[in-house]
Structures are given as structure tokens and as C-alpha cells.
């Protein structure tokens, strides 16, 4: 979370942004929120990004304006327009490419005066892991798989009963480049588990920590994923 | 209550042919993958075969492998097995039971029917 203040004679306005991570190939968005005004025609909004000259994204006058966007964000940004007048300069970004990563910064002017506040971009891939009964191995198994991820993460077992232990010696963990080169499948084989236990399938790189568990009883299998980002908000 | 109820032994010639049939109330049968286990008088039990619940898939134990095959039909809420090529060390009492997975470590079944008697002699 970054506040910034911004002072235009004796006016200044807040204006918050939140740490965020993209996941490439997919559809972002970079949050900002500033003190909210209802003239919405006085109310410009800039996007910019270290290291690149030219706008990320403008809005003003109660529409966009990019006649000074930068090449590498054509047709990829939107900012919310029906809720720009309650305070919301969050950017919509299509399509997250590694190359989105950096340091952005929300710039707000309205009636009231003016103020800014940067946020940091995390681009990667992360998605929620599946774990199922694997009939493949010879001994009762379960298999965690996941089929995005970058950078490659670490993959780690737990299990509710043996809290503490160790499982790499019974696990087998691999990771396979997608067809765009860039992310990963993850698929990790836990051996020897046995019924009425929850086993868990960690998955985590700098970008984010994902989870999925399982319960195997004579009745049914109970399963469970959670998916959060790291270092956000 | 879970009852499965099994039914089509007999005695029957060496080379012979079977089908034994289990009758399953009491849970949701497509829910749960349905397995055949026997057991040699005096031995212990031994898993036999397995079915998922939309029967995409089958397995069996070695000795089978070639000569039973396992079907289900959830209208019906029964599966079967078909015993072809019989041999006298065939000979058991066939039990069906259910299980979450396909897994089948015999210490993990909790419901058992009656059992079926297959007897293979001449």
C-alpha cells in the first residue's frame, strides 16, 4: 500500500496504490484510488512507467486520450470511466506481458488539486493447483498439477497427520515449458499415502503461494484449493 | 445403510463360464468406483477388479488379467463380473464392495456384502 500526497498551492489530494502481480497472457489491473470528485470533466489521470517515455495511459475530460501512449501499451489499457468520478484510476491492462513489470506511477489532477503515488508491478504466471487419486504408480499416490507457473516454483508436500515430515524422498516433482516457451506445468507424485488424512500440494514462486488439499475417506474425496498473492496490499 | 448384495456363483467345470452380479443400495452408487475381492476358504482376501464410477476405467489383478471383466450399469445400480477360462484356483467366495478411489488395499473396504460361492471343479 503507497500513499502519496500531491500540493497544488495549498491543495493536495490522497491518492493510494496497491502492490500488484499480472499474470502473463492474462488480463491485470493496476489499482489506484484518489479522493473522489463529481466535476468529472476536471479530472485527469495519467499512467506512467519507469524507464519509458511516453504515457502508459491518460484520461481526461471525461474520456481517454492517447495521443502520447507508448507503442507497448496500444490497445492493451482501460481505465474504469463509470467509476473514475467516485475515485477510481485503476488501469486496466490486457494481455500481461513479462516486459509489464516495473514501477508505474497514477498521477490524479482534479478540481481539488493534485497528487500522486508509484506502485510496483509483478508479472509472472500462477495458477490453482488440481490434486487427484493417481492410478498410474504402483502404490497409492496423488498427483498435484498446476499448468501455469512462472518463474519456477518450489513445490513441497505436508500432510495433517505427519505434520513436520519431510516428503521429498516420496515425492517426484517436474516441470514442463508450455508451448509459448515462457510458463510451466507443474505436476509433483506423492507415494505411499494412505485414506483419512489431509495431504497438501504447496506450490509458490516471488509472485504467488498456491495450496491444494485432499482427503481420501472410504466415503468420499474432499478437495480444496486457495490461491494467494504475495506481497500484495 | 450401504448393502450390496451378491449373487451368480455355483460350481462350475474347469474352462467354464460365470457371471456374478451385485445388487448396491443404500448410497449414491455413481459416486463411488465398485470393486470384486475374493477369498480362498481359510486365506485371506485378495482384490480382484475395479470400475470407476462412468466405467472409463478398468483394472484387474494379474491372475485375472485376459479371462474376467468387470462392467457396471448405473441405471441399474449393479456391477458385475464376467468369469471366463475358469481354473480351480478361481475357486473363492466373491464379494463386491465400494470404495471413494480406485485404490485397493483390502484394509480399506468397510462394506462387505454375503459373498457369492464360486466353486471350479470337475
Known amino acids: 500500500l503507497i500513499i502519496g500526497f500531491g500540493i497544488s498551492g495549498k491543495h493536495f489530494i490522497t491518492v493510494t496504490t496497491f502492490t500488484s502481480a499480472g499474470n502473463i497472457g492474462e488480463d491485470g489491473t493496476l489499482s489506484c484510488t484518489f479522493e473522489p470528485d463529481i466535476k468529472l470533466n476536471g479530472i485527469v489521470i495519467q499512467w506512467l512507467k519507469e524507464g519509458i517515455k511516453g504515457l502508459v495511459h491518460e484520461f481526461k475530460e471525461g474520456k481517454d486520450d492517447l495521443s502520447q501512449q507508448h507503442e507497448m501499451f496500444r490497445g492493451r489499457t482501460a481505465v474504469f470511466a463509470d467509476q473514475v468520478v467516485v475515485g477510481n484510476a485503476s488501469l486496466r491492462l490486457k494481455n500481461v506481458q513479462l516486459t509489464d513489470a516495473g514501477t508505474y506511477t497514477c498521477y490524479i489532477r482534479t478540481s481539488k488539486g493534485k497528487g500522486n503515488a508509484n506502485l510496483e508491478y509483478k508479472t509472472g504466471a500462477f495458477s490453482m493447483p488440481e490434486i487427484n487419486v493417481d492410478y498410474n504408480a504402483s502404490s497409492e499416490s496423488l498427483r498435484c498439477e498446476a499448468p501455469r507457473w512462472f518463474p519456477q516454483p518450489t513445490v513441497a508436500w505436508a500432510s495433517q497427520v505427519d505434520q513436520g515430515a519431510n516428503f521429498s524422498e516420496v515425492s517426484n516433482t517436474s516441470f514442463e515449458l508450455n508451448s509459448e516457451n515462457v510458463t510451466m506445468k507443474v505436476v509433483s507424485v506423492l507415494y505411499n499415502v494412505t485414506i483419512n488424512n489431509t495431504y497438501s500440494c504447496m506450490i509458490e514462486n516471488d509472485i504467488a503461494k498456491a495450496t491444494g488439499d485432499i482427503k481420501v475417506t472410504d466415503s468420499e474425496v474432499k478437495r480444496r484449493s486457495q490461491l494467494q498473492l504475495l506481497n500484495s496490499g | 445403510e450401504v448393502q450390496l448384495v451378491e449373487s451368480g456363483g455355483g460350481l462350475v467345470q474347469p474352462g467354464g463360464s460365470l457371471r456374478l452380479s451385485c445388487a448396491a443400495s443404500g448410497f449414491t452408487f455413481t459416486d463411488f468406483w465398485m470393486h470384486w475381492v475374493r477369498q480362498v476358504p481359510g486365506k485371506g482376501r485378495e482384490w480382484v477388479s475395479r470400475?470407476?464410477?462412468?466405467?472409463?476405467?478398468?483394472s484387474y489383478e494379474d491372475s485375472v488379467k485376459g479371462r474376467f471383466t468387470i462392467s457396471r450399469d448405473n441405471a441399474k445400480n449393479t456391477v458385475y463380473l464376467q468369469m471366463h477360462g475358469l481354473r480351480a484356483e478361481d475357486t473363492a467366495v466373491y464379494y463386491c464392495?465400494?470404495?471413494?478411489?480406485?485404490?485397493?488395499?483390502?484394509?480399506?473396504?468397510?462394506?462387505w456384502g454375503q459373498g457369492t460361492l464360486v466353486t471350479v471343479s470337475s
Open positions: 464392495t465400494r470404495f471413494s478411489t480406485g485404490w485397493h488395499r483390502i484394509e480399506y473396504f468397510q462394506h
Open positions: 470400475i470407476s464410477p462412468d466405467s472409463s476405467s478398468t
